[in-house]
C-alpha cells in the first residue's frame, strides 16, 4: 500500500432527500465488485486520503428512462462530480447532461489532496438505476 | 513484464451469428494499433492471465446509424461487458443502451482473476462499425 | 519523472478559424486544474515526449446545444482525436459523433511515440463549451 496505489470503485447506495442532489455511495467486497483501498467513505461521500493526480470516472444510468423522458423535462437532468469539502477547495470537476440519453459516462485526470471529499450531484427529477453494472463511481491514484 | 503491467487494446474482428450476441475481437501490431501484452484471446474473447484490479474500457459505434434507427427498434440496442467464464464467476460488469445515440463509451475498475474470460454482448439487430477508431475494447491492470 | 509517468490534462483555450477544425488546448496550474507533466504544448496541440502506451481520454460538450441543434444539421458534429504529425504516423485514434447528444466522452489505450502530436478535430458548425468541467483532454503514460 505504501506505493500509493489508492483506488476505489463504488456502487450506488441511495439518493438523498429532495433538496439534496447528492448520490450516496457504498463499497466493499460483501456488496459485490465494489471496493475501497485507501480512500474512504464519509456518509456515502468519497474522501481522498493521499495527495496525487487521480483518474476519476463515473457512469450513471437513469432508472426509468426513455429518450423522451430525458428530453421532455424543462430542466435537463445533469450529473456533476466535484470537490464539495473542504469548502475552500470546492469546485466542479466533471459535468454532463443526459439530453436524449439515459446514461452518461466519463472520466478525467485531476489533482486531489488528502481530505478532499468528492460529491456527485444529480439534478433533476429522474432517479438513477442502482444496478451495479449501470451506475458506478471510482477513483484511481495515478501519480504524485 | 514481471511488474504485472498486463494490458490489451482490441479491435473488432466480427460479430457472431444471429443467436450469438458476442462481439469477436482481434489484436496485434500487424492489424493496426491493437495489442495484447499479457491477456490473450480465446476464440475472439479476452482472457485474463493475471489477478488484479483492472480498468476495463470500451467504445462501440453502430455502423449504419441515425438517432431514428436506434430509437425506432422495439428492443433497444444494448452493450454489456461481463465475465462469461468460468460460469461460477459469470457477472455483468458494465451495461449501456444506445437509446438515441450511435456510440456508447465507458470504463470501470473491477477485480479480475486469472482465467476470467470477458464477453461483450451486443443485443439488437444493429451491427457495429469495424473502424478501429470507432469500436475498441481494452483492459489495463492497475494494481494487485 | 524518470519513472516515465508522463501525464497531462488540458482545458480548451480556443477553436481555430473556420477552415481549421482543430481545438486549441492549454494547461497549467495557474489556469485551474489542468497540467502538463512530461508532454508539452505546441501551438495548442499536445506533443508526446516519451514512447509508450498511453491512455488518451477526452470530453467535449457543445456550448449552445439541445438535442434538436445536434440532430438538425446535415453534417453531424464529430470529434476525432488523432496523431496529426509527423505526417508519416498520421492516423485517427478515436472518433465520435454527437447525434442527438451535446456531450461526447471516451477513452482508449494507444501506443504513442516521442514527437507524436495529437490533434482533436471538431467538425461541424457548433462550438465547444470552454467550461473546464465540460471540455477537457488528457493523456496518461501507462507502460513502456
Amino acid at each position: 500500500e505504501s506505493l500509493g496505489w489508492d483506488i476505489a470503485e463504488l456502487q450506488l447506495n441511495h439518493t438523498g432527500p429532495q433538496q439534496d442532489p447528492r448520490l450516496y455511495w457504498q463499497g466493499g467486497p460483501a456488496l459485490g465488485r465494489s471496493f475501497l483501498r485507501g480512500p474512504e467513505l464519509d456518509k456515502g461521500q468519497l474522501r481522498i486520503r493521499r495527495d496525487g493526480i487521480y483518474m476519476v470516472h463515473i457512469q450513471v444510468t437513469l432508472a426509468i428512462c426513455s429518450s423522451t423522458s430525458t428530453s421532455r423535462h424543462h430542466h435537463p437532468t445533469t450529473l456533476a462530480v466535484g470537490i464539495c469539502s473542504p469548502a475552500s477547495r470546492s469546485i466542479s470537476l466533471l459535468r454532463l447532461s443526459f439530453h436524449q440519453g439515459c446514461t452518461i459516462a466519463s472520466q478525467r485526470l485531476t489533482p486531489l489532496a488528502r481530505g478532499d471529499t468528492l460529491c456527485t450531484n444529480l439534478t433533476g427529477t429522474l432517479l438513477p438505476s442502482r444496478n451495479t453494472d449501470e451506475t458506478f463511481f471510482g477513483v484511481q491514484w495515478v501519480r504524485p | 513484464e514481471s511488474l504485472g503491467w498486463d494490458i490489451a487494446e482490441l479491435q473488432l474482428n466480427h460479430t457472431g451469428p444471429q443467436q450469438d450476441p458476442r462481439l469477436y475481437w482481434q489484436g496485434g501490431p500487424a492489424l493496426g494499433r491493437s495489442f495484447l501484452r499479457g491477456p490473450e484471446l480465446d476464440k475472439g474473447q479476452l482472457r485474463i492471465r493475471r489477478d488484479g484490479i483492472y480498468m476495463v474500457h470500451i467504445q462501440v459505434t453502430l455502423a449504419i446509424c441515425s438517432s431514428t434507427s436506434t430509437s425506432r427498434h422495439h428492443h433497444p440496442t444494448t452493450l454489456a461487458v461481463g465475465i462469461c467464464s468460468p460460469a461460477s464467476r459469470s457477472i455483468s460488469l458494465l451495461r449501456l443502451s444506445f437509446h438515441q445515440g450511435c456510440t456508447i463509451a465507458s470504463q470501470r475498475l473491477t477485480p479480475l482473476a486469472r482465467g476470467d474470460t470477458l464477453c461483450t454482448n451486443l443485443t439488437g439487430t444493429l451491427l457495429p462499425s469495424r473502424n478501429t477508431d470507432e469500436t475498441f475494447f481494452g483492459v489495463q491492470w492497475v494494481r494487485p | 519523472e524518470s519513472l516515465g509517468w508522463d501525464i497531462a490534462e488540458l482545458q480548451l483555450n480556443h477553436t481555430g478559424p473556420q477552415q481549421d477544425p482543430r481545438l486549441y488546448w492549454q494547461g497549467g496550474p495557474a489556469l485551474g486544474r489542468s497540467f502538463l507533466r512530461g508532454p508539452e504544448l505546441d501551438k495548442g496541440q499536445l506533443r508526446i515526449r516519451r514512447d509508450g502506451i498511453y491512455m488518451v481520454h477526452i470530453q467535449v460538450t457543445l456550448a449552445i446545444c439541445s438535442s434538436t441543434s445536434t440532430s438538425r444539421h446535415h453534417h453531424p458534429t464529430t470529434l476525432a482525436v488523432g496523431i496529426c504529425s509527423p505526417a508519416s504516423r498520421s492516423i485517427s485514434l478515436l472518433r465520435l459523433s454527437f447525434h442527438q447528444g451535446c456531450t461526447i466522452a471516451s477513452q482508449r489505450l494507444t501506443p504513442l511515440a516521442r514527437g507524436d502530436t495529437l490533434c482533436t478535430n471538431l467538425t461541424g458548425t457548433l462550438l465547444p463549451s470552454r467550461n473546464t468541467d465540460e471540455t477537457f483532454f488528457g493523456v496518461q503514460w501507462v507502460r513502456p
Epitope: - | H14, P17, Q18, Q19, A63, I64, L127, R130 | -
Partner: antibody, heavy 119, light 107 residues
C-alpha cells in the same frame, strides 16, 4: 458435413396453404438461426426473415408479415415455412439459409423448393 | 430499406479473362457486403464476406473490394466452373437486401 435439405417442389392453387421444410444435419440445430429467402425470376433474391431456433421466436421482413409463418420441429432438426392463402405472386423458389460465424453472412443454403401457384 | 443495385444484369466473357462485377448500395454500408454465386442448377454458395474476405474453399482468383456505397467482385482468370449468376448482399441492417444479380456467360 453440414447440410440443409429442403422438401420437394409444390404445385398449389390460389387460396391454399403450403408448408416447406428444411432439415438440418451435421451441427447442433438450436445453435444457429434459420433464415428464409425468396427468389423470383423478375425480382431476384428477397430476405423473408428468420427464426431463432433456440427460442422459436420468428422475425419477419415487412413484406412477409401476415400470411407467412416460420416454425420449428426441434427434435427433428427441421425448420418450416408455411404460406397461407396462396397468391400468384407467391410463385417462386424458397431457400433456407444459415450463418456460420458472422451475422447476416449465409454460408449454408438449402437446395431450394420451387412453389408453383396455378388455378 | 437499403437498395442494392447491380447495373449489369448479364456479362459475356472468355475463359481466362479478368471479370469485374459491380454493386452499389443506396447508402454507406460500412463494408458489410457479401457476394454469392448461384450455379445454373440453383445451388447457392458464399464467395466473399465483409467486402474482401474470401470464404474458406473459394479459389483465390476471386477477390472483393470497395467501401462506402461502391463494391466490386473480381475474377482474375475466368474458368468454366465460374459460369453462374453473382449476387451482392448488404449485411449491415435489417431487412437484408440483395442485388438483382449479374449473370456471367461465355462469349
Amino acid at each position: 458435413e453440414i447440410q440443409l435439405v429442403q422438401s420437394g417442389p409444390e404445385l398449389k392453387k390460389p387460396g391454399e396453404t403450403v408448408k416447406i421444410s428444411c432439415k438440418a444435419s451435421g451441427y447442433t440445430f438450436t445453435n444457429y438461426g434459420m433464415n428464409w429467402v425468396k427468389q423470383t425470376p423478375g425480382k431476384g433474391l428477397k430476405w423473408m426473415g428468420w427464426i431463432n431456433t433456440d427460442t422459436g421466436e420468428p422475425t419477419y421482413a415487412d413484406d412477409f408479415k401476415g400470411r407467412f409463418a416460420f416454425s420449428l420441429e426441434t427434435s427433428a432438426s427441421t425448420a418450416y415455412l408455411q404460406i397461407n392463402n396462396l397468391k400468384n405472386e407467391d410463385m417462386a423458389t424458397y431457400f433456407c439459409a444459415r450463418e456460420e460465424d458472422y451475422r447476416y453472412v449465409f454460408n449454408y443454403w438449402g437446395q431450394g423448393t420451387t412453389l408453383t401457384v396455378s388455378s | 430499406d437499403i437498395q442494392m443495385t447491380q447495373t449489369t444484369s448479364s456479362l459475356s466473357a472468355s475463359l481466362g479473362d479478368r471479370v469485374t462485377i459491380s454493386c452499389r448500395a443506396s447508402q454507406d454500408i460500412s463494408n458489410y457486403l457479401n457476394w454469392y454465386q448461384q450455379k445454373p442448377d440453383g445451388t447457392v454458395k458464399l464467395l466473399i464476406y465483409y467486402t474482401s474476405r474470401l470464404h474458406s474453399g473459394v479459389p483465390s482468383r476471386f477477390s472483393g473490394s470497395g467501401s462506402g456505397t461502391d463494391y466490386s467482385l473480381t475474377i482474375s482468370n475466368l474458368e468454366q466452373e465460374d459460369i453462374a449468376t453473382y449476387f451482392c448482399q448488404q449485411g449491415v441492417t435489417l431487412p437484408l437486401t440483395f442485388g438483382a444479380g449479374t449473370k456471367l456467360e461465355l462469349k
